[in-house]
């Protein structure tokens, strides 16, 4: 990093490689909750129109669906996987598809799915085919 | 290579404007994304917004989502940053960043060239 841009300690804005590189943030559809019409589907999208740049470089693309006896509701989020979220881990912060699993959560279908590449959460994938373990 | 050169800081009053520049020499301009960053004393990098090289869509970090804008024209090799309401909190060193293209851009800043910035206070 060149000397006239200060690195400032502790700082979580500027994440660099292990080249010394700093890391271009994710774009993510950025919707909180939103009502879903998504449902027995393999994949729908996210019907989100905003793309933001997440806050930190190490943030992620998430996506969360939920269905209770009432609605359906989608979120679209960034977040850090080293943080919980909905006190689950970001198991799949590193795949460039939001590959929903499902999470238990008392009086509701809960599932969650992160990823990252760019916008990845506008496409949400329930289709079994994709969660098997893959040989590549 | 693209090299960056930052221009169009200065001092502005709340609520004020101003239009920042960077201009890239190189032929190659019209192939990256481009970033505006910024760095507020002390403080680490803001990734603003970014622009895609074709179609131009745009990308703005909740900070500043209604009051800034960016846009390129390619046919001169320059990346604008319109910036409106300016407030103090938006006081900081702007740089432009280039953003490899690929299979799916390059999520490392390719750092073959950084410009000094240009420096935006925004104060009464």
């Known amino acids: 990093i060149p000397p006239h841009v200060q690195k400032s300690v502790n700082n979580d804005m500027m994440v660099t490689d292990n080249n010394g590189a700093v890391k271009f943030p994710q774009l993510c559809k950025f919707c909180d909750v939103r009502f879903s019409t998504c449902d027995n589907q393999k994949s729908c999208l996210s019907n989100c129109s905003i793309t933001s740049i997440c806050e930190k470089p190490q943030e992620v693309c998430v996506a969360v669906w939920r269905k209770n006896d009432e609605n359906i509701t989608l979120e679209t989020v960034c977040h850090d996987p080293k943080l919980p979220y909905h006190d689950f881990i970001l198991e799949d912060a590193a795949s460039p598809k939001c590959i929903m699993k499902e999470k238990k959560k008392p009086g509701e279908t809960f599932f969650m799915c992160s990823c990252s590449s760019d916008e990845c959460n506008d496409n949400i994938i329930f289709s079994e085919e994709y969660n098997t373990s893959n040989p590549d | 290579e693209v090299q960056l050169l930052e221009s169009g800081g200065g001092l502005v009053q709340p609520g004020g404007s101003l239009r920042l520049s960077c201009a890239a020499s190189g032929s190659t301009f019209t192939e990256y994304r481009m970033w505006w960053v910024r760095q507020a004393p002390g403080k680490g990098l803001e990734w603003v917004s970014?622009?895609?090289?074709?179609?131009?869509?745009?990308y703005y970090a909740n900070s500043v989502k209604g009051r800034f804008t960016i846009s390129r024209d390619n046919s001169k090799n320059t990346l604008y940053l319109q910036m409106n309401s300016l407030r103090a909190e938006d006081t900081a060193v702007y740089y432009c960043?280039?953003?490899?293209?690929?299979?799916?851009?390059?999520?490392?800043?390719?750092?073959?060239?950084w410009g000094q910035g240009t420096l935006v206070t925004v104060s009464s």
């Open positions: 970014a622009i895609e090289p074709i179609g131009h869509r745009t």
């Open positions: 960043a280039k953003q490899a293209p690929g299979e799916k851009w390059a999520r490392r800043w390719d750092l073959d060239y």
